[in-house]
């Protein structure tokens, strides 16, 4: 149990002890929430304290002080989700339809993700919100018929699903148009069968 | 303490209008997105309708677009949701929402429509 | 659309049973995922953000896992208190949406 002398200048568990080189001695680290009141000599251990309000230690330390907790900027595009506690940092996110467009250890802005045009959609990508989208065009058999930043391409309706059949053949931008098999002429509504 | 405190609930005929308004307090209102999401009697949460911290963008789910109308005013700490050509599957409990992630509810208003 | 697949929408369990419920999001939706528990006449409370991450002041036997379309949320020993409704939440790209939800009743 810490303090206890160490002449390797190593502690046997690290996470939750420090070599104090004046002492030569391994003392005891605060844990989370906490930090440094008092440091340790070689007949007393470490004392910690609780962080006050609106600070934290993350870590197991031997910080003599707490990291001041600090707001997400909305300006940014930045939002908190989760607050502040004394064992945890604001937790911030890029908004919903936004990418991270700065980084420096975690984001520190973030912008709206560009809008695919019809006939596209935005590439599936490992890490979402890791960057701007990409659009690719619809693959063969499917469209995609507004701009927005998250629409996927559909398959165009088959008409002979629903006893009808093709009046005009769908795009990468537009629905297959079907029709009555009486009917001569194709009506206005896409996908579907006017009545 | 973080409080979310609904308005405006009650009984509308089918077509008609109502207005719900959300007051909130103990956190930095303008910090945050706010939602409106509702729950049908013995159903489950769908979400209605958000509004980016600033109020610049509106987002909402497709059954009520051009229906319902969200709004916030950042220095009365207040979120409305004005909601027209109410139809019966509109029936629920609606619930102010802070953040995108949900991080603190409101307990609801009863939004009935019925003839 | 993102839909959010919940399964199973009801399970039976005793006090003390480990809990497994799962979501599967029909795109990638990286980490972006919350998971509430709403018991009856009450306000939804949520108990773990950005997948894994537990809220202040839920016990540790609610746990997270998952990323991209798979997500997990785990009771390791259930108590009494903990016989609820539980949701998933996708917040990656608007429109925000929920799974069904899974009704956790008494066996």
């Known amino acids: 149990v810490p303090p206890y002398g160490s002449e390797n200048q190593t502690c046997r568990d690290q996470e939750k002890e420090y070599y104090e080189p004046r002492h030569r001695i391994c003392c005891s680290r605060c844990p989370p929430g906490t930090y440094v009141s008092a440091k340790c000599s070689r007949s007393r251990d470490t004392v910690c304290a609780t962080c006050a309000e609106n600070s934290y230690n993350e870590h197991w330390n031997y910080l003599t002080i707490c990291q001041l907790c600090r707001p997400c900027d909305p300006v940014m595009g930045l939002e908190e989700i989760a607050p502040c506690t004394s064992k945890r940092k604001t937790q911030c996110r890029c908004q919903p339809g936004m990418f991270c467009a700065a980084w420096a250890l975690e984001c520190t802005h973030c912008e709206l993700l560009s809008d695919c045009p019809p006939g596209t959609e935005a590439e599936l990508k490992d890490e979402v919100g890791k960057g701007n989208n990409h659009c690719v065009p619809c693959k063969a058999g499917h469209f995609q018929n507004t701009s927005s930043p998250s629409a996927r391409c559909q398959p165009h309706t088959r008409c002979e699903d629903q006893g009808l059949v093709e009046a005009a053949p769908g795009t990468a931008q537009s629905d297959t148009t079907c029709r009555n098999p009486s009917e001569s002429l194709p009506p206005e509504m896409s996908g579907t069968m006017l009545m | 303490e973080v409080q979310l405190v609904e308005s405006g609930g009650g009984l509308v005929q089918p077509g008609g209008s109502l207005r719900l308004s959300c007051a909130a307090s103990g956190f930095t209102f303008s910090s945050y997105t706010m939602n409106w999401v509702r729950q049908a009697p013995g159903k489950g949460l769908e979400w209605v309708s958000g509004?980016?911290?600033?109020?610049?963008?509106?987002y909402y789910t497709d059954s009520v677009k051009g229906r319902f109308t969200i709004s916030r005013d950042n220095a009365k700490n207040t979120l409305d949701l004005q909601m027209t050509s109410l139809r019966a599957e509109d029936a629920a409990i609606y619930i102010c929402?802070?953040?995108?992630?949900?991080?603190?509810w409101g307990q609801g208003t009863m939004v009935t429509v019925s003839s | 659309d993102i839909q959010m697949t919940q399964s199973p929408s009801s399970l039976s369990a005793s006090v003390g049973d480990r809990v497994t419920i799962t979501c599967r999001a029909s795109q990638g939706i990286s980490s972006a995922l919350a998971w509430f528990q709403q018991k009856p006449g009450k306000a939804p409370k949520r108990l773990i953000f950005d997948a894994s991450s537990l809220d202040s002041g839920v016990p540790s036997r609610f746990s997270g896992s998952g990323s991209g379309t798979d997500f997990t949320l785990t009771i390791s020993s259930l108590q009494p208190e903990d016989f609820a409704t539980y949701y998933c939440q996708q917040y990656n790209n608007y429109p925000l949406t929920f799974g069904g939800g899974t009704k956790v009743e008494m066996k």
């Open positions: 929402a802070q953040g995108f992630a949900f991080t603190n």
């Open positions: 509004v980016a911290p600033s109020g610049d963008r509106t």
